[in-house]
């Protein structure tokens, strides 16, 4: 019961997380104009991964797509790639985890197969979450760097009499959505991996039992009951073949160096 709950919760949390990653990727407010130096502006700028927008105080908003690939900063391209990879992995993970859910019966699917699928989807969710967190963090780092560079430029040149106020950008709502969504996907993935332990039949080492036949004595040693993973309990005395799933020790986390802001 606890396994089913953990798996179900992991699925729901991951689903919310991936929906959040998709939302963040599509949002226009990755960076928003910093109003600290000009709180009374009648024109507000904000930018996303795919287009930049200008909202006038009159209420009119105009958005322009980035209609170039080669002319865009490499970092922006990298962030786009990370977010798309995160979405694709998450979507595949969701698809796999639907079939892996204990509450859903598909034909005569063995528990071991469900355990394998649960682990696979869990790893996919973890990597998906890491991709989203990495993408958002790279963008945030880029913003911080640009912010301080433009601040430095603001007070130099023309003997301090700068007429053109440089537009500085700060963190937009999409960054926070992305961080939270990535975290949720990551947590959902971990929960799926934990659920996998409970789903998998335990490796059972049966003691040799002597069966005394009426005629002559024969010692029968049942063997070959190697479970696909070393977790959970296998109450049924049936042969389970190794499906190639990883054990907990094999599950890799993918640490990556990020500049967190």
């Amino acid at each position: 019961m606890a396994v089913t709950a953990c798996q179900g919760l992991g699925f729901v949390v991951s689903l919310i997380g991936i929906a959040g990653i998709i939302a963040a990727t599509c949002m226009d407010q990755w960076s928003t104009q910093d109003l600290y130096n000009n709180p009374v502006t009648a024109v507000f700028n904000y930018q996303g991964l795919w287009r930049s927008c200008v909202r006038e105080s009159s209420g009119f908003t105009e958005c322009r797509g980035y209609f170039t690939l080669l002319g865009l900063p490499a970092m922006l391209q990298a962030v786009r790639a990370l977010m798309i990879v995160g979405i694709v992995l998450g979507a595949i993970g969701l698809l796999v985890s639907i079939f892996a859910l204990k509450c859903i019966r598909i034909g005569s699917m063995e528990d071991s197969a469900k355990a394998n699928m649960t682990l696979t989807s869990g790893i996919m969710f973890i990597v998906s979450g890491l991709c989203a967190i990495a993408g958002v963090s790279v963008f945030a780092n880029m913003l911080v760097t640009n912010f301080w560079m433009s601040t430095a430029n603001m007070y130099t040149g023309m003997g301090g009499m700068v007429q053109t106020v440089q537009t500085r950008y700060t963190f937009g709502a999409a960054l926070f959505v992305g961080w939270v969504a990535g975290g949720l996907t990551l947590i959902g993935g971990v929960m799926m991996c934990i659920a996998c332990r409970g789903l998998a039949p335990e490796e059972t080492n049966y003691k040799a039992v002597s069966y005394h036949a009426s005629g002559h004595s024969v010692a029968y040693k049942p063997g070959g009951f190697k479970a696909s993973t070393g977790f959970g309990s296998n109450t049924k005395n049936k042969k389970i073949y190794d499906g190639g799933a990883r054990t907990e020790d094999e599950v890799q986390s993918y640490p990556s160096k990020h500049d967190y802001v």
Epitope: V43, S52, E56, S57, S58, G59, E62, T167
Partner: antibody, heavy 118, light 113 residues
Framework: QVQLVQSGAEVKKPGASVKVSCKAS????????MNWVKQAPGQGLEWIGQ????????KYNGNFKGRATLTADTSASTAYMELSSLRSEDTAVYFC???????????WGQGTLVTVSS | DIVMTQSPDSLAVSLGERATINCKSS????????????LTWYQQKPGQPPKLLIY???TRDSGVPDRFSGSGSGTDFTLTISSLQAEDVAVYYC?????????FGGGTKVEIK
């Protein structure tokens, strides 16, 4: 077509208040900011403030803050500007104007002359 | 507040001739987000409310004759009437549409010589 029709001329004594109305027609009144502009006799234009009828949000020019009050009645598609503690320098024509793309004033009322005289 | 300075205060031009009005702002009106200048031009005839001519420094409002054109960027802007007509006699105002409070220039009176 878009029309902004303002109330008639007013003569007030110093220290009194005046409330000028601006009735809008021909567009969705709630969806556009309404601005108020002052023009003293033989002088230029001075922005007083603006109101968004949809939610009552207002922005004021610091020179008028505290003395000018902007309100709107969406059911009557009418915007109001009340100016209190009137003084002689408030004698002017007051215009209402719709705020449009490019943060410009695309349609204007005909103007209301407010005369402050003892 | 952004200060808008118009020059000249008045201008006398012969019919059919070119009239040029200048407007200078104390701060740049160029928005980096869309590369548009938030400067507006209005025409006001005696006894009438102002009429919108040009917004975004160079975009003519619908129904405005093409003899009116706006140019300039940043802090320096120009309104040009390529061939002055009798009906163009009016006071012309420039307006900062970039930062609150929205401010107007002092106006330029255009007359026929």
């Amino acid at each position: 077509q878009v029309q902004l029709v303002q109330s008639g001329a007013e003569v007030k004594k110093p220290g009194a208040s005046v409330k000028v109305s601006c009735k809008a027609s021909g567009y969705a009144f709630s969806n556009y900011w309404m601005n108020w502009v002052k023009q003293a006799p033989g002088q230029g234009l001075e922005w007083i403030g603006q109101i968004y009828p949809g939610n009552g949000d207002t922005k004021y020019n610091g020179n008028f803050k505290g003395r000018a009050t902007l309100t709107a009645d969406t059911s009557a598609s009418t915007a109001y500007m009340e100016l209190s503690s009137l003084r002689s320098e408030d004698t002017a024509v007051y215009f209402c104007a719709r705020y449009y793309r490019g943060n410009c004033f695309d349609y204007w009322g005909q103007g209301t002359l407010v005369t402050v005289s003892s | 507040d952004i200060v808008m300075t118009q020059s000249p205060d008045s201008l006398a031009v012969s019919l059919g001739e070119r009239a040029t009005i200048n407007c200078k702002s104390s701060q740049s009106l160029l928005n980096s987000g869309n590369q548009k200048n938030y400067l507006t031009w209005y025409q006001q005839k005696p006894g009438q409310p102002p009429k919108l001519l040009i917004y975004w420094a160079s975009t003519r409002d619908s129904g405005v004759p093409d003899r009116f054109s706006g140019s300039g960027s940043g802090t320096d802007f120009t309104l040009t009437i390529s061939s002055l007509q009798a009906e163009d006699v009016a006071v012309y105002y420039c307006q900062n549409a970039y930062t609150y409070p929205l401010t107007f220039g002092g106006g330029t009176k255009v007359e026929i010589k």
